[in-house]
Interface confidence: low
């Protein structure tokens, strides 16, 4: 069997929404992968678990289900949400994602995704993770790649 | 550490402009605001605008649109204010202050200020 | 704007005993996140200004702890407790929750 490549793309979209007596931000963080089959079979993507941590904590985690197959030669884009809670040991985030009198409300959080394949009644497990920028301020729609955090650095604690 | 050098003084007629520096060192430049603060002689503290090095991105006072020009040098990290067509009421001492801005920490804001320019505008 | 009033221009206070300073906004700085944007600055005589307090109630680095902030989302207090000669000088308030920025007219710190 050939390889079946998964590349993440970027977040596409995240949209925001606080709850102000409990100091919690929420981020429903939708992300685009591209998934390649270089085999002359089809696969199934069976399942894609995915989950988004922020200062090392989880703060999100979402499964997808018998998602789709790709044909042979074939590439598909998948998109999937995480809601994300921001909250408890983490409120002081809600001071900086709410606060007007500045610009920017870039957070760097870690995306990681793990998509199972399966061809034959094989099994194939493949894992990515990335460094992202989400604004955590408003809603907001990127292009893609657009919020690639390369500098791989955690947030101030 | 962290220092913000502002010259001295300026003697400039009226009608002309001047351009004011501040020359950071000691941190970042780009992750922090730069402010600029007027206080004419005997006079309190009036805030003009301030400046994201990182973009060039802007705030002004409406009392200063017109009046007051903000820039930076990233590469000399080095701010300026641009002031034109000056009067007697111009005649202050003009101070930059640093502010954190779009990080995790903005609490500190306005920590570290120059030693001032003062400017007279005098035939 | 928002206007910030100081309504005493100074307040004379004997070494060693304690002071008052108040400051009082034209709209509540107090945001939604549970934050009052309020800056507390002193300017010694012929110095630049210097953070005191951020953020209404705390205390700016190398700040020692004689002095303190706090009030509503539109009265100001800042405290100092065992004035010290070195106080002198003339105390801001500073608005930062919305653009622009404004400072009160200033209190001045004067020594019996």
């Known amino acids: 069997p050939r390889s079946i490549d998964v590349k993440y793309i970027g977040v596409k979209s995240a949209y925001v929404s606080y709850d102000v007596q409990k100091r919690t931000i929420y981020l429903n963080i939708t992300n685009t992968l591209n998934i390649t089959n270089n085999n002359y079979y089809s696969v199934e993507v069976e399942n894609i678990t995915a989950q988004v941590q922020f200062a090392k904590t989880v703060i999100g985690k979402a499964r997808l289900n018998n998602i789709t197959h790709i044909g042979p030669l074939d590439m598909k884009q998948i998109d999937y949400t995480v809601p994300t809670v921001i909250a408890e040991e983490m409120s002081y985030m809600y001071d900086f994602c709410t606060l007007i009198s500045i610009k920017v409300h870039n957070i760097v959080l870690m995306m990681q995704v793990t998509v199972t394949t399966t061809y034959f009644g094989h099994s194939e497990q493949i894992s990515q993770e990335r460094y992202q920028y989400v604004d955590c301020g408003r809603n907001t729609t990127y292009q893609l790649g657009q919020s690639e955090y390369l500098n791989v650095l955690q947030p101030q604690q | 550490q962290v220092q913000l050098q502002q010259p001295g003084a300026e003697l400039v007629k009226p009608g002309a402009s001047v351009k004011l520096s501040c020359k950071a060192s000691?941190?970042?430049?780009?992750?922090?605001?730069m402010h600029w603060v007027k206080q004419r002689p005997g006079h309190g503290l009036e805030w003009i605008g301030n400046i994201d090095p990182s973009d060039s991105d802007t705030h002004y006072n409406q009392n200063f649109r017109g009046k007051a020009t903000l820039t930076v040098d990233k590469f000399s990290t080095t701010a300026y204010m641009h002031l034109s067509s000056l009067t007697s009421e111009d005649s202050a001492v003009y101070y930059c202050a640093r502010s954190r801005g779009g990080t995790y920490d903005y609490g500190e804001a306005m920590d570290y200020w120059g030693q001032g320019t003062s400017v007279t505008v005098s035939s | 704007d928002i206007v910030m009033t100081q309504a005493a221009p100074s307040v004379p206070v004997t070494p060693g005993e304690s002071v008052s300073i108040s400051c009082r906004s034209s709209?509540?700085?107090?945001?939604?996140?549970?934050?009052?944007?309020l800056f507390w600055f002193l300017q010694r005589p012929g110095r630049s200004p210097q953070l005191l307090i951020y953020?209404?109630?705390n205390l700016a680095s190398g700040v020692p702890d004689r002095f303190s902030g706090s009030g509503s989302g539109t009265a100001f207090t800042l405290r100092i407790s065992r004035v010290e000669a070195e106080d002198v000088g003339v105390y801001y308030c500073m608005q930062h929750l919305e653009y622009p920025f404004t400072f009160g007219s200033g209190t001045k710190l004067e020594i019996k």
């Open positions: 709209k509540s700085l107090l945001h939604t996140n549970g934050n009052t944007y």
């Open positions: 000691g941190y970042t430049f780009t992750s922090y605001w």
């Open positions: 953020r209404m109630s």
